[in-house]
């Protein structure tokens, strides 16, 4: 095929691939008709002047996972047809000025996973057709004003996993076509007002895993097309009331792992496309009326691992579509009888690991489709008569680790449990805490020498347990999570992050290596 170097493979489709540690320089002669060249996993340390001079038809050039640390400014001379250039996963610390000069057709430039210390406006000033620029995984500490001013056609910019401590409000001002901006895993402490104002076509903004403490009230007001906003694992302590008010297209919002103490009514919305909201691992202490009222299409709401001690009766107003609600691992002692009344389509509620002492008899009155209720590890001594009677679809009920008081008042509950044992699972059964003479005995088989009143019992569903809600312990003792951990649903165990030390959350819950492009 017009001469293929011995250390390479050349295909009929004008594709050349050169790999192997024995390669220490760009192989020659390369086929003049090559359109795609890959140089991977070699020991090449530098690119000298014009090593690709005779393959001017080249469209894609990948020089990845090498020992490359030095490039001569004229290395890519005569590659005017080149559309894709990747220098990712090398050891570049410095880019020579003019390196990309003459690459008039270049659309994708990948410089990720190197050791770049700085970029300058002159680096990309010739790349007027560039659509994608990947700079993640370098050592950049700041981006100078003007660095991207000539990249007016850019649609995707990744600056994640660098060491950026601040961003100039002018650095993105000319990127009106940008659709994806990733700044995750840096050291940003704040984002100046106006930083994103020019990004009118932005669809994804990734700011997770920084040290952002405050959000300016109008930070996202020009980003009406934003669909995905990642703010998790920062230090955000409060949300300005209007910060999310003009994001009608938003369908992903992550705020977990921050320091939020309160949520003001109507803070979210209107966001008609948002179906899941993850707020776990914050410091929220109460939920006021109508706090989620704009989220009419929300299906999954995760509020676990906060410090919630009070939920206003109207806190969940408007959540008519909600299927799963996670409130586990909070500080709830009491719940208003009407708090879940509007959640007519709720299937799964997790309330475990709270301090609930009692439940109102009507707490689940309007939530007829409930399939799973997690109440383990609370302070419950008894439950009101008939609290579960109308829940014909209930197939998982967790009641263990509560201080059940096994006197005669427990009989109605005991009888119901006796007839509904499959719903309790096989792992852990509720046991008596008092009186002392029956402590530790199973609540289901305890012998209370009192006449047993008849109790209305609904028919147990033919499926004793649905797989959305399996019998996994929801508060395991282990301190690490494996990728095979069974997690019941985002409500119960997707967010039952008790298997992960808090110190691990930064790496486990971000996009880290997975967000490579």
């Amino acid at each position: 095929y017009h001469g293929c170097p011995s250390e390479c493979t050349c295909s009929r489709a004008s594709q050349v691939e050169c790999t192997g540690a024995r390669i220490v320089a760009v192989p020659t002669p390369l086929p003049w008709n090559a359109m795609s060249l890959q140089i991977l996993n070699t020991h090449i340390t530098e690119l000298n002047e014009s090593p690709f001079l005779n393959i001017s038809a080249l469209i894609a050039l990948r020089i990845e996972k090498n020992e490359l640390s030095r490039i001569t400014p004229g290395a890519f001379r005569n590659l005017g047809s080149l559309r894709y250039l990747s220098l990712a996963n090398n050891k570049l610390q410095v880019l020579p000025i003019g390196l990309f000069q003459g690459l008039d057709s270049l659309e994708s430039l990948l410089l990720s996973s190197n050791q770049l210390l700085q970029i300058q406006p002159a680096h990309f000033s010739q790349c007027s057709n560039l659509k994608e620029l990947q700079l993640h995984g370098n050592h950049l500490e700041y981006i100078p004003d003007g660095a991207f001013d000539h990249l007016v056609g850019l649609t995707k910019l990744n600056l994640g996993k660098n060491s950026l401590t601040h961003i100039s409000p002018r650095v993105f001002q000319h990127l009106g076509n940008l659709q994806v901006l990733r700044l995750y895993e840096n050291r940003l402490t704040d984002i100046p007002m106006g930083t994103f104002d020019g990004l009118v076509n932005l669809q994804e903004l990734a700011l997770q895993q920084n040290q952002i403490g405050l959000l300016s009230p109008g930070l996202f007001h020009n980003n009406h097309n934003l669909q995905r906003l990642y703010l998790s694992n920062n230090h955000i302590s409060q949300l300005p009331p209007s910060v999310f008010m003009q994001l009608p297209q938003l369908n992903r919002l992550t705020l977990f792992g921050n320091s939020l103490k309160e949520l003001s009514p109507g803070i979210f919305g209107p966001m008609p496309n948002l179906r899941e909201l993850w707020l776990y691992d914050n410091h929220i202490s109460s939920l006021p009326d109508n706090v989620f009222s704009n989220l009419r299409q929300l299906q999954v709401l995760i509020l676990s691992r906060n410090q919630i001690s009070f939920i206003s009766p109207g806190a969940f107003n408007g959540l008519t579509e909600l299927r799963e609600l996670s409130l586990h691992t909070n500080a709830l002692q009491d719940l208003d009888g009407n708090v879940f009344r509007m959640l007519a389509n709720l299937q799964n509620i997790s309330l475990q690991n709270n301090r609930l002492r009692q439940l109102p008899g009507n707490i689940f009155a309007n939530v007829n489709g409930l399939m799973a209720i997690q109440l383990q590890n609370n302070q419950l001594e008894n439950l009101p008569l008939g609290i579960f009677d109308h829940l014909g679809k209930l197939c998982e009920l967790r009641l263990y680790d509560n201080p059940w008081r096994c006197d005669s008042d427990i009989l109605p509950l005991r009888n119901w449990l006796l007839l509904n044992q499959p719903r309790l699972g096989t792992d852990t059964v509720p046991v008596c805490f008092s009186p002392a003479n029956v402590r530790g005995q199973s609540l289901i088989i305890i012998n209370v020498n009192v006449a047993v009143p008849s109790v209305h019992v609904p028919e147990v569903p033919s499926y004793p347990e649905t797989p959305w809600y399996p019998d996994t312990p929801s508060y395991p003792d282990t301190t690490s999570v494996s990728s095979t951990t069974e997690l019941t649903s985002p409500v119960e165990d997707y967010t039952d992050l008790t298997t992960i030390q808090v110190t691990d959350d930064r790496s486990v819950w971000g996009m880290t290596q997975a967000q490579s492009g």
Epitope: N251, E276, T466, T485
Partner: antibody, heavy 119, light 110 residues
């Protein structure tokens, strides 16, 4: 563009295990759900379960609990399904599929992996 | 589990004519604003392809001759003017509970 590329066909002996891979690209792997679906020869579709790569969290169809194990490797943006104690009725095409939210439809599918269990 | 019953099992329609496929659920899969029913097309040797999500929302890139309707337990997929490339098996799927699929409807040209 979203792509799910599955591993090649497998022929296995009864009682053995098989691990099917699903390499994802074109989207932020950790942020979406990966489903697995079975299609026996000449039959319809059967949902096996899903995995949420953020934490490797899983939900299973009760029928496949103990039979299938779903895992992910976020560093390679790959989802895996391992089937154990294989029997002839496990002979099928297995698909991975992408979903935006837990209750959403499966909008992108892998090409399928044929697993044949035969002695 | 929710059982989805598709009818008919197979359907022969002339080119340019309307094709209608029904799917009945053993219980309601709808709320006041959403129906958790989706429709897929599968051609021989290929994976399923999403056509309609949430009962009536046309997936991006799908021709507008495909439409979905219904709520509660009864749903319909309609191909307004059958084209040769529409020959396939069509499946409904519910995501209200544990996901289940209908048995499929084979669409052929008469």
């Amino acid at each position: 563009e979203v792509q799910l590329v599955q591993s090649g066909a497998e022929v296995k002996k009864p009682g053995s295990s098989v691990k099917v891979s699903c390499k994802a690209s074109g989207f932020t792997f950790t942020d979406y759900y990966i489903h697995w679906v079975k299609q026996a020869p000449g039959q319809g579709l059967e949902w096996i379960g899903l995995v949420y790569p953020y934490i490797g969290g899983t939900n299973y169809n009760q029928k496949f609990k103990g039979k299938a194990t779903l895992t992910v490797d976020t560093s390679t943006t790959t989802a895996y399904m391992e089937m154990s104690s294989l029997r002839s009725e496990d002979t099928a095409v297995y698909y991975c599929a992408h979903g935006d939210n837990k209750y959403d439809a499966m909008d992108y599918w892998g090409q399928g992996t044929t697993v044949t269990v035969s002695s | 589990d929710i059982v989805l019953t598709q009818s008919p099992d197979s359907l022969a329609v002339s080119l340019g004519e309307r094709a209608t496929i029904n799917c009945r659920a053993s219980q309601s899969v709808s709320t006041s604003s959403y129906s958790y029913m989706h429709w897929y097309q599968q051609k021989p040797g290929q994976p399923p392809k999403l056509l309609i999500k949430y009962a009536s929302s046309l997936e991006s890139g799908v021709p507008d001759r495909f439409s979905g309707s219904g709520s509660g337990t009864d749903f319909t997929l309609t191909i307004s003017s059958l084209q040769a490339e529409d020959v396939a098996v069509y499946y409904c799927e519910q995501s209200w509970e544990i996901r289940t699929f209908g048995g499929g409807t084979k669409v052929e040209i008469k």
